[in-house]
Interface confidence: medium
């Protein structure tokens, strides 16, 4: 008798997800001589138990804590970049000026990036069928809960001036219900954190409007001064001279607004 | 100790690949071998690396799609050039970063050097 | 691409004295100190002198002094001796695999 099984709104597991995982944990260690000490069997075996057997509408932070800490990681907390519906742009960006970091250049962002996954209540199956859809489903799911933790985590970690990246072109430049609206904002610590640094990337060739001026970025100026942070906001006008600017910015054309 | 060799007089346009061998050691799964040229009365010019337990290869920018790097034995690693000019010219070198205790990112065992010669 | 600019060169120096070269990398180096030195004859690979910035590697005089962190290095050789004339190169490590020379300090010693 076949048995029955959950039938989710959200696409299954990324297939190879148990390959994935420690393919890329063994790639980071390697590259990020800090990280040598990590024994990838160890770290996939915690992202395992976290959700393996579990409902997966059911997930708690708590579950994924022995990832946490085999995954933990001392990045200089004043090199921070969050982004919001950009993540392509903040990668290549981090790309070029090394020293900077997003949360997927950590080991644990690294790790999930792009990734989808879930088991199911009572049996040590992964479930490559469908997943939990944090709107249509259940907000307690694997992917969500994993990232509402990591990037908690990394808020919490951030120091002096924090950068994020803002897409533009979206109507709301800023989102509440974004994890940086939810999750990354009120996780700043101000007694670390002296700014926040917003970077409005334009979307359009002949897009002259200041951004910065949006209401949705206005209502992030406000949250972000009640909780004590100094804010500024700066319009990227031209990405793509932007990123080449960060890769040579001895280039005359550089001194002009970008 | 590591040893090159291959290094040869070829012409223009041509291919060429170069064998960097161990002796006395096998490399292990953390160590990093790459290979360095330095073109005559010029600096060092790092080109890729491979690391020995995975096969992640890593390259310079400007040496991607030309040159190869690849582990064929426990104690050997090669790299294959093709679309030789004359500006290839240099003492090829191969080198080691064990990636051991605090040896992290730095060569700390050179070859001797195998001269490659392009010239028509 | 990841530079790392040397100054001054070439530099001289009389038996005795001091040399100071610097290396300065136009990013950040890995951890702040992923900076090795190293020392090159004529016709032999280079030799490490200095790794992870300011240690000295095994059966290197202590005359030889690496300092710095971040973008900005320094390699000073007290007491120079006719045997430190040689050309030196700063070497960095960066995140995701990367490793980057310096052009090269030639010391001429008189």
């Known amino acids: 008798v076949p048995r029955w099984r959950q039938q989710w709104s959200g696409p299954g597991t990324t297939k190879r997800f148990p390959e994935t995982v420690l393919a890329r944990c063994v790639k980071y260690t390697e590259i990020h001589p800090e990280m040598r000490h990590v024994d990838c069997q160890s770290v996939w075996d915690a992202f395992k138990g976290a959700f393996i057997s579990k409902h997966p509408c059911n997930i708690t932070e708590e579950d994924y804590q022995p990832l946490m800490k085999l995954g933990t990681q001392t990045v200089p907390c004043n090199k921070i970049l969050l982004w919001s519906r950009i993540k392509d742009l903040a990668h290549q960006f981090t790309q070029v000026q090394r020293d900077m970091f997003t949360l997927e250049d950590t080991l644990l962002g690294y790790l999930a990036d792009d990734l989808t996954w879930c088991g199911e209540f009572n049996t040590s199956k992964i479930n490559y069928q469908s997943c939990p859809d944090w709107r249509k489903d259940c907000s307690n799911n694997p992917v969500s809960v994993f990232w509402k933790t990591v990037s908690r985590r990394f808020a919490e970690a951030a120091c002096d001036v924090v950068h994020v990246m803002l897409n533009g072109s979206r109507s709301k430049i800023f989102d509440k219900n974004s994890t940086f609206g939810s999750v990354e904002v009120h996780n700043l610590q101000p007694e670390k954190v002296q700014t926040l640094e917003a970077w409005v990337i334009h979307g359009g060739r002949e897009d002259s409007r200041d951004l910065c001026q949006d209401p949705t970025i206005k209502e992030l100026e406000s949250i972000i001064s009640k909780r004590n942070i100094q804010f500024s906001c700066k319009n990227i006008y031209r990405p793509d001279k932007f990123l080449q600017c960060v890769k040579n910015p001895e280039d005359s054309s550089c001194t002009s607004e970008i | 100790s590591l040893e090159e060799s291959g290094g040869d007089l070829v012409k223009p346009g041509a291919s060429l690949t170069l064998t960097c061998t161990a002796s006395?050691?096998?490399?292990?799964?953390?160590?990093?071998i790459c290979w360095v040229r330095q073109a005559p009365g010029k600096g060092l010019e790092w080109i890729a690396c491979?690391?020995?337990?995975?096969?992640?290869t890593y390259y310079a920018s400007w040496a991607k799609g030309r040159f190869t790097i690849s582990k064929t034995s426990s104690t050997t690693v090669t790299l294959q050039m093709t679309s030789l000019t004359a500006a290839d010219t240099a003492t090829y070198f191969c080198?080691?970063?064990?990636?051991?205790?605090?040896?992290?990112?730095?060569?700390?065992?050179w070859g001797p050097g195998t001269l490659v010669t392009v010239s028509s | 691409a990841q530079v790392l600019t040397q100054t001054p060169s070439p530099v001289s120096a009389a038996v005795g004295g001091t040399v100071t070269i610097n290396c300065q990398a136009s990013?950040?180096?890995?951890?702040?100190?992923?900076l090795a030195w190293f020392q090159q004859k004529p016709g032999q690979p280079p030799k490490l002198l200095i790794y992870?910035?300011?240690t000295l590697a095994s059966g290197v005089p202590s005359r030889f002094k690496g300092s710095g962190s971040g973008t900005q290095f320094t390699l000073t050789i007290s007491e120079v001796q006719s045997d430190d004339a040689a050309t030196y190169y700063c070497?960095?490590?960066?995140?995701?695999?990367?490793?980057?020379f310096g052009g090269g300090t030639e010391v001429v010693v008189k």
């Open positions: 080198a080691g970063d064990p990636r051991t205790g605090s040896n992290v990112g730095y060569f700390n065992l």
């Open positions: 491979i690391v020995a337990g995975t096969t992640n």
């Open positions: 006395g050691f096998s490399f292990s799964s953390r160590y990093w």
């Open positions: 990013q950040s180096v890995y951890n702040n100190n992923y």
């Open positions: 992870s910035a300011s």
């Open positions: 070497q960095a490590y960066y995140s995701g695999g990367i490793y980057a």
